[in-house]
């Protein structure tokens, strides 16, 4: 159940231009390489669903309502997307600028067995997550401008991500 699920965009504007790629600094050790840094002249799809934000070939949905992590992931799945994989500093800054003072779940989870953080695409995350000592298994971004460990059962807003069409 997802009451009042709205996008963050005000007018549902869908861009129609074709955007090239800006090169991203090499931070593969921390974030993992992402496709936005590997093909500098690539053209992306630019069409996003209404109320989704377009950025560098991706569409992002910022919820207004709050849900536990699993429900957030399930919601993204119903939209043909996943929780956001924030694997470059540029992407992190872009999403945090929109997030403002709110905290949003992203697609990063702790793997208790090997005591590592992994993205939901299974690639390893070697950066810093704050509040790790709290034994929280999920992560939010937003208010603190860092990756914050958070309880998966507590309700937060969330960010979905999909490729632009």
């Amino acid at each position: 159940y997802f009451p009042q699920v709205f996008g963050k965009s005000n007018d549902g504007f869908v861009p129609t231009e074709s955007y090239g790629t800006t090169s991203v600094q090499n931070v593969s050790q921390i974030f993992g390489r992402n496709d936005e840094s590997t093909m500098p002249t690539r053209s992306y799809g630019t069409v996003c669903p209404r109320n989704w934000d377009f950025h560098q070939g991706k569409c992002f949905f910022f919820s207004f309502s709050e849900s536990p992590w699993k429900d957030s992931m399930d919601y993204c799945a119903t939209q043909g997307s996943t929780l956001a994989i924030v694997n470059t500093p540029e992407k992190l800054k872009y999403l945090q600028d929109i997030a403002g003072i709110e905290n949003y779940f992203i697609g990063l989870v702790r793997q208790p067995g090997e005591k590592k953080w992994r993205w939901i695409n299974n690639s390893v995350f070697n950066g810093n997550v704050t509040n790790q000592d709290q034994n929280f298994d999920c992560v939010t971004i937003g208010l603190t401008k860092t990756y914050d460990a958070a309880s998966c059962e507590v309700s937060y807003r969330w960010i979905c991500e999909m490729n632009a069409k």
Epitope: S28, G32, R33, N34, D35, T38, W69, K70, M73, A77, T82, L83, I85, G107, L108, V109, R110, Q111, P112, G113, E114, W117, R118, W119, I120, N121, N122, S123, V124, D137, C138, C152
Partner: antibody, heavy 125, light 112 residues
Amino acid sequence: QQQLEESGGGLVKPGGTLTLTCTASGFSFSSSYYMCWVRQAPGKGLELIACIYSSSGRTWYATWVNGRFTISRSTSLNTVDLKMTSLTAADTATYFCARSYAGYGGYGYAYFNLWGPGTLVTVSS
Amino acid sequence: DIVMTQTPASVEAGVGGTVTIKCQASEDIYSSLAWYQQKAGQRPKLLIYDASTLASGVPSRFKGSGSGTEYTLTISGVQPDDAATYYCQNYYDSTGSGYGAAFGGGTEVVVK
């Protein structure tokens, strides 16, 4: 000591049905694990069949399975079953049970760090 | 589906020599790659994960490297006990919806 043990293999006729069981010991399914079945035909490579997230039961199947196989788990018995139907000679293989760590909700899984010894399934008339 | 192409299918090495096995993914798998060793009639054994991290108890003569679509397993100072078939495995899942893992075809290492 953490272990996996497969059982239920044997000779089955083409078109037949067989259920394999993987019994885990030394760890609990209530924790975050992804349990999978992998098979290996004689002299061939490894092929992933199906996986199940131990705590929630969320499943994944290889596309070629086409509904012939069903994976399930019992948290009380610490077992994972693979029910195989409409078997053909091409299904003749050693079937391994394998475990991967997983993160919350069954996401953030990875490599297989624990394997069973395997059980041989022979499909022949 | 991501396809893993492993080369060569077979390689021969002398004791003390070096063996290099390559694994190519059909798309970027972001270092989500494991290597396994399987001896005849036995279960596979994890050697390396996340492309370059040595699994517990694995000798340091095994080394994993690579990124993007190209990955390599190097065995330095080959021992008779290293005679086995080696498999790479991708566990990158671009959809976040299921396993999507794929094994390479395997490389048989023969030690002379």
